[in-house]
């Protein structure tokens, strides 16, 4: 909980308040919503951070609500329920009692139901594609120094070990990042792949969670790349448990976002 | 030395509001925070909720939320709470205290509501 | 909510005597917990914060211990100031939330 203590704030999430009575009296950052205080030095978790946003002001909220049966992905945002550690619940319920099962980056992963519902566990994505297309340029960018560059805002951003990028694939104008963790692999003070997606993809919306840094300015050899089109999958190491009807409509966990 | 004073005793009619300040002294007011505790006669402590005075960013205990509004005035370094729609059981001490383990704490200030 | 419980409600000891006092969290809330005494009468005042770490002006038998769940208040050897009402506090999370106090009265 030790963060740029001569100012007291948090370099790796703006979501939070920051005051200089942690423990030893060293500076502690709360995430606004939950006040749990987190890791400055590390990212949040997303869970923190879905709840910080949902108890964020809210500026534009008298426009309609289209149907919950609208086939338009609602970038995930919910208020959830955090465990004391700042990890999604197995379980998430709303204000009407629905609730639903989760995986760990917080993508419902079972049919709604009500309080009754059991979610044994919370079920590991470990492998997550983001899928990107990037706006028009001059000609495709070099494979290599693509990958190579990706890899390196992976590390350096956002501090993910670089054995957990597993590959990247680039058909013009296509690019996908695959990114995989095990359980098993993931030791402590390791960052989750989930909470990396959750900030790259903050990021390429021009929504950077990190204080006081500017947004992210992706450049391969210097061409800027830019972002037109991002679709994330999550896949989770037990299948999800959708009724055959939903099955045959989706199949992958998906965030849509353009 | 840290100092929280606060006002003095109040009595309000139920249905009515009542503003309780507490002036805060001998340190950076914007970067602590400020709690607001209660005390009913002869009870426990019950936490109302916090406000971080540079931002004025509060956190409502949900059983106050309705009725209890927090604010802060960093020019005069000093918080304040307004309790709304005011009732019997709301009768206590209405304490502040600063930093998140209530390090330093005001001398109370008295609410009674009665008919 | 987090909940803290404390034991015993009510303690009877002479002075000399070693207290201890107890408080359970709901959940693992690392040593986020803090310890008050209040007399009557008075404003509570901080004795113990984040579960270990003693506070300047604070009489060096009052310790506190623990991590988790489970958290303790000892005082070494009683003196007749220290009969009065404790209670503790945790800053894990919003809401914060204390204990429901333990009296140490005189045996």
């Known amino acids: 909980h030790t963060a740029a203590q001569d100012n007291c704030t948090c370099p790796t999430n703006k979501m939070t308040v920051c005051s200089p009575d942690g423990p030893g009296g060293r500076c502690q950052c709360r995430a606004l919503g939950s006040g749990m205080a987190v890791d400055c030095s590390t990212l949040t978790s997303k869970c923190l951070l879905l709840k910080a946003r949902m108890s964020a002001p809210k500026n534009a909220r008298t426009l309609v609500r289209p149907s919950e049966h609208a086939l338009v992905d609602n970038d995930g945002l919910y208020d959830p329920d955090c465990d004391p550690e700042g990890r999604f619940k197995a379980r998430q319920c709303n204000q009407t009692s629905v609730c639903w099962c989760v995986n760990s980056v917080g993508v419902r992963r079972t049919d709604k139901g009500d309080l009754s519902l059991r979610c044994d566990e919370l079920v590991r994505t470990h492998h997550i594609l983001i899928d990107l297309r990037h706006r028009p340029t001059a000609g495709a960018f070099n494979h290599s120094d693509l990958d190579a560059e990706l890899r390196r805002l992976f590390r350096e951003r956002y501090r993910l070990h670089p054995k957990f990028v597993a590959a990247v694939h680039y058909e013009q104008p296509t690019i996908q990042i695959e990114l995989r963790q095990n359980t098993s692999q993931k030791a402590a003070g390791d960052v989750d792949i989930g909470d990396a997606a959750y900030y790259f993809e903050r990021d390429i919306k021009g929504e950077s969670l990190f204080q006081g840094r500017g947004g992210l300015d992706l450049r391969v050899r210097g061409e800027p790349l830019q972002v037109e089109r991002t679709l994330i999958y999550y896949l989770d190491e037990i299948p999800p448990k959708f009724s055959m009807k939903r099955l045959t409509h989706h199949h992958h966990h998906h965030h849509h976002h353009h | 030395q840290v100092q929280l004073v606060q006002s003095g005793a109040e009595v309000k009619k139920p249905g009515a509001s009542v503003k309780v300040s507490c002036k805060a002294s001998?340190?950076?007011?914007?970067?602590?925070?400020i709690h607001w505790v209660r005390q009913a006669p002869g009870q426990g402590l019950e936490w109302i909720g916090t406000i971080f005075p540079s931002n004025a960013y509060a956190v409502y205990n949900q059983k106050f939320r309705d009725r209890a509004t927090m604010t802060a005035d960093t020019s005069i370094s000093t918080a304040y709470i307004e309790l709304s729609r005011l009732r019997s059981d709301d009768t206590a001490v209405y304490y502040c205290?600063?930093?998140?383990?209530?390090?330093?704490w005001g001398q109370g200030t008295t609410v009674t509501v009665s008919s | 909510e987090i909940v803290l419980t404390q034991s015993p409600a009510t303690l009877s000891l002479s002075p000399g005597e070693r207290a201890t006092l107890s408080c359970r969290a709901s959940q693992n809330i690392g040593t986020s917990i803090h310890w008050f005494q209040q007399k009557p009468g008075q404003s509570p005042r901080l004795l113990i914060k984040y579960a270990s770490e003693s506070i300047s002006g604070i009489p060096s038998r009052f310790s506190g211990s623990g991590s988790g769940t489970d958290f303790t208040l000892t005082i070494s050897s009683l003196e007749p100031e220290d009969f009065a009402v404790y209670y503790c506090?945790?800053?894990?999370?919003?809401?914060?939330?204390f204990g429901q106090g333990t009296k140490l009265e005189i045996k």
């Open positions: 001998g340190y950076s007011f914007t970067t602590h925070w």
């Open positions: 205290a600063r930093a998140s383990y209530f390090d330093y």
């Open positions: 506090q945790h800053s894990h999370s919003w809401p914060f939330t």
